[in-house]
Interface confidence: medium
């Protein structure tokens, strides 16, 4: 199988870990989402509704 | 030069903590890690954990996941490893090493800079 | 845990004869291997990584190859500097844990026949 992480697809420098089951991006301080797209706002509120249950932003998403 | 240099190897006690230190110099953290592996006497490579200082993030392997701290102090570009509990057989050279993350936007994940080691013997 | 396992654990080889060494991960690792020599009272050096890509100042000679779970390093034409042990190591990530790890594995001594 291809590597997933081969295309680059953590937006804003987020790291890309290649699983077997697919990919994770760990995001870089300050963003979030599964590919790293919504910046966390200052205030700490975010660009996208509430993590997930046990996610805070920037931890890795599938 | 990039340089990594290991410290605080020595004798330990039993039940104790083992503490070491690397100093890293020549290279920024934004697209490498710093990572620890040790080599018990005669044996191979042993991989404990490494740290993402860019992304304040630790990652410790699951054979030594709740003896194992590894902290940064990069004011002075430094990295500590913390073993707890130590028994004999946690007698090793003690090596960290430059973990490279990302080189030029592509995952890369060796370990292409290593300090000297630094042997830690336990025993009473 | 991944494991990943050597084969030989050591190999005897005549001067200017090819060595050849595999590495097998207990999951599929894409290309994230590298490899690794280490003499004895030394550091270990890193010679291959991304599977196949050589490290800076890393005779020709040396090469790698392979993808998924199956690896192999080849010393073209081994030299006498050439001996001590080899190590590959991987980097795998488990997303139920967010752990992200490397393993190496157990070496394999290479020495003049």
């Known amino acids: 199988r291809a590597d997933p992480c081969a295309a680059r697809p953590c937006a804003h420098g987020g790291r890309c870990y290649a699983h077997f089951s697919g990919l994770v991006c760990a995001c870089a301080p300050g963003y979030m989402g599964a590919r790293c797209e919504f910046p966390v706002h200052p205030d700490g509120a975010s660009a996208l509704p509430a993590a997930p249950p046990g996610l805070r932003p920037g931890d890795p998403q599938r | 030069e990039v340089q990594l240099v290991e410290s605080g190897g020595g004798l330990v006690q039993p039940g104790g903590s083992l503490r070491l230190s690397c100093a890293a110099s020549g290279f920024t953290f934004s697209n490498y890690g710093v990572s620890w592996v040790r080599q018990a006497p005669g044996q191979g490579l042993e991989w404990m954990g490494y740290?993402?200082?860019?992304?304040?993030?630790?990652y410790y392997a699951s054979w030594v996941n709740g003896r194992i701290t590894i902290n940064p102090d990069t004011s002075k570009n430094q990295f500590s490893l913390q073993l707890n509990s130590v028994t004999p057989e946690d007698t090793a050279v003690y090596y960290c090493?430059?973990?490279?993350?990302?080189?030029?936007?592509?995952?890369?994940?060796?370990?292409?800079?290593w300090g000297q080691g630094t042997l830690v013997t336990v025993s009473s | 845990d991944i494991v990943m396992t050597q084969s030989p654990d050591s190999l005897a080889v005549s001067l200017g004869e090819r060595a050849t060494i595999n590495c097998q991960a207990s999951?599929?690792?894409?290309?994230?291997l590298s490899w690794y020599q280490q003499k004895p009272g030394k550091a270990p050096k890193l010679l291959i990584y991304?599977?196949?890509t050589l490290a800076s100042g890393v005779p020709d000679r040396f090469s790698g190859s392979g993808s998924g779970t199956d690896f192999t390093l080849k010393i073209s034409r081994v030299e006498a500097e050439d001996v001590g042990v080899y190590y590959c190591q991987s980097y795998y990530y488990s997303s139920g844990s967010s752990y992200g790890a490397f393993a190496f594995g157990q070496g394999t001594k290479v020495e003049i026949k």
């Open positions: 090493a430059r973990v490279a993350l990302v080189v030029a936007g592509v995952a890369y994940y060796g370990m292409d800079v």
């Open positions: 991304r599977t196949s």
């Open positions: 740290i993402d200082p860019a992304f304040g993030r630790t």
């Open positions: 999951q599929n690792i894409y290309s994230y």
